[in-house]
Amino acid sequence: LEVQVPEDPVVALVGTDATLCCSFSPEPGFSLAQLNLIWQLTDTKQLVHSFAEGQDQGSAYANRTALFPDLLAQGNASLRLQRVRVADEGSFTCFVSIRDFGSAAVSLQVAAPYSKPSMTLEPNKDLRPGDTVTITCSSYQGYPEAEVFWQDGQGVPLTGNVTTSQMANEQGLFDVHSILRVVLGANGTYSCLVRNPVLQQDAHSSVTITPQRSPTGAVEVQVPEDPVVALVGTDATLRCSFSPEPGFSLAQLNLIWQLTDTKQLVHSFTEGRDQGSAYANRTALFPDLLAQGNASLRLQRVRVADEGSFTCFVSIRDFGSAAVSLQVAAPYSKPSMTLEPNKDLRPGDTVTITCSSYRGYPEAEVFWQDGQGVPLTGNVTTSQMANEQGLFDVHSVLRVVLGANGTYSCLVRNPVLQQDAHGSVTITGQPMTFPPEA
């Protein structure tokens, strides 16, 4: 008997449901009356769930487990674990006995994303160059233990004088506190990155400290670290600021916005005045705010082609630049579902289900699943075509052999907006026509 489980651990977020996949190859003439299926914890051999004597014997594990009874006869012995907790992490063994027998262990890796870190300074006022300051970075309710990295404004790692502590709460989730002690320079940005090693999820925050000092004329150019996300057709503000020295006048200012990669000019300010847009007349500065050091750029009626990195270059006597990324997005429409053939359907027929969703960006991720939420990956063909505006139309085709009845769901995910659009179709065992006639 061949018992198969995934090689890689199943990763599940705390509070969600997880499927521990397990399958076996039933021999001809196999009936469920012959089947013994036992799920147990690999280490302690504690019983989790079982099927015997032709029936589901239920959960022995906090009533949070279930089998897929309709799929057992086809050799699907997978276990559904609901409302996953940190304590569930570990190895589960799937043991199948008919006449022959076999077992295999599947690992469950539990994870929880860390919150965006909060940053505190001590002392937090009247700071001067040369002062020692303690910066604390705190992030909460993550699992497993985090990796914490500190870096300066140039991305150079800061490793000295860092103390990190991680404490688990009653649910086993960790709160992380990392402390960096630094001697202040003329000014500086300090970033703390809390990484979840399982989810490869980074949560970061930064603090910029500008100590009181005699003006030196040095220009500091600042832009947001994270990409600016803008919906197609809306307006976006690419933020950029600089620190004007006392006595600064706009007549001294050169401000250039350009595309980072090609250096194509986008917008400029020089000779004391706005030189206007060199980018399809869709850009504007904030002229009333320039004297205060606000060099932000407004980009109107955003298009897919605008996506990329924009550099803000400021030159007075000193000079500096920084690049800000624009990430363009467009939500996908609710999928429409079509069946082929779409009438006189019977169990055993092969049917093609097409899921179509329109005018999204960037490319979508498409997932199919059955009525039990089990992913359907076989016999799926997905195509994505960009139109003239660069927006994608998605068509995903699933070929299935009809069972007695079944629900098939298609989920179209926009990875940038984290927006899910879904459609589903239910096919019953009786001869039927799709869509159902009124």
Epitope: G153, Q154, A186, N187, T216, G217, A218, V219, E220, V221, Q252, N254, I256, Q258, K263, L265, S268, T270, E271, Q275, T311, F313, S315, I316, R317, D318, F319, G320, S321
Partner: antibody
């Protein structure tokens, strides 16, 4: 009076390294961006690298990017150019220059770099 | 990158002549242009900044003009000490801040 004095030039083999220094005086060094400019024998001026007053922004000529590093020590009123993986075409007189309001308003006397086997 | 095209590359003239050197940028540099004078074995010396402004101590026979992509350095009446090589340089946008190829002014 503004003064810029370069040093550190010399003869070096291809693939070798040199570090040029520029000592500044007569002005508030940390308030000014600085550049290095070079001039190959019998050729024109070529801008090489620039660094902002605080040292937090640096820019390079494409042909030296990854080989040369411009840096400064504002406490010592000094500008540096670390040159690695030197090539014959890097042979030149290297000048340091102070950036005024979008101009190089003061120049050093130059230091000579020869790359030859 | 912005390309600065300087012309002529060499020029012969006599004391007292009026001389014009031009510099053309490959795109609009919005008057962010400087002119330098260099004598053999010496460092360059600033003459004109922001296209039209004379640097301190530069004789009034030197003048700069132009806008957009086209700029001119004029010496109204050549003096013996003016024989040298002249360079333009732009300061528009993110470096490289390139120089023109130079104009060698020689005695006729």
């Amino acid at each position: 009076e503004v003064q810029l004095v370069e040093s550190g030039g010399g003869l070096v083999k291809p693939g070798g390294s040199l570090r040029l220094s520029c000592a500044a005086s007569g002005f508030t060094f940390s308030s000014y961006g600085m550049s290095w400019v070079r001039q190959a024998p019998g050729k024109g001026l070529e801008w090489v690298a620039a660094i902002s007053g605080g040292g937090n922004y640096t820019y390079y000529l494409d042909s030296v990017k990854g080989r040369f590093t411009i840096s400064r020590d504002n406490a010592k009123n000094s500008l540096y150019l670390q040159m690695n993986s030197l090539r014959a075409e890097d042979t030149a007189v290297y000048y340091c220059a102070r950036q005024g309001l979008r101009v190089m308003d003061n120049w050093g006397q130059g230091t000579s770099v020869t790359v030859s086997s | 990158d912005i390309v600065m095209t300087q012309s002529p590359s060499s020029l012969s003239a006599s004391v007292g002549d009026r001389v014009t050197i031009t510099c053309r940028a490959s795109e609009n540099i919005y008057s962010n242009l400087a002119w330098y004078q260099q004598k053999p074995g010496k460092a360059p010396k600033l003459l004109v900044y922001a296209a039209t402004n004379l640097a301190d101590g530069v004789p009034s026979r030197f003048s700069g003009s132009g806008s957009g992509t086209d700029y001119t350095l004029t010496i109204s009446s050549l003096q013996p000490e003016d024989f040298a090589t002249y360079y333009c340089q732009h300061f528009w946008g993110i470096p490289p801040w390139t120089f023109g190829g130079g104009t060698k002014l020689e005695i006729k």
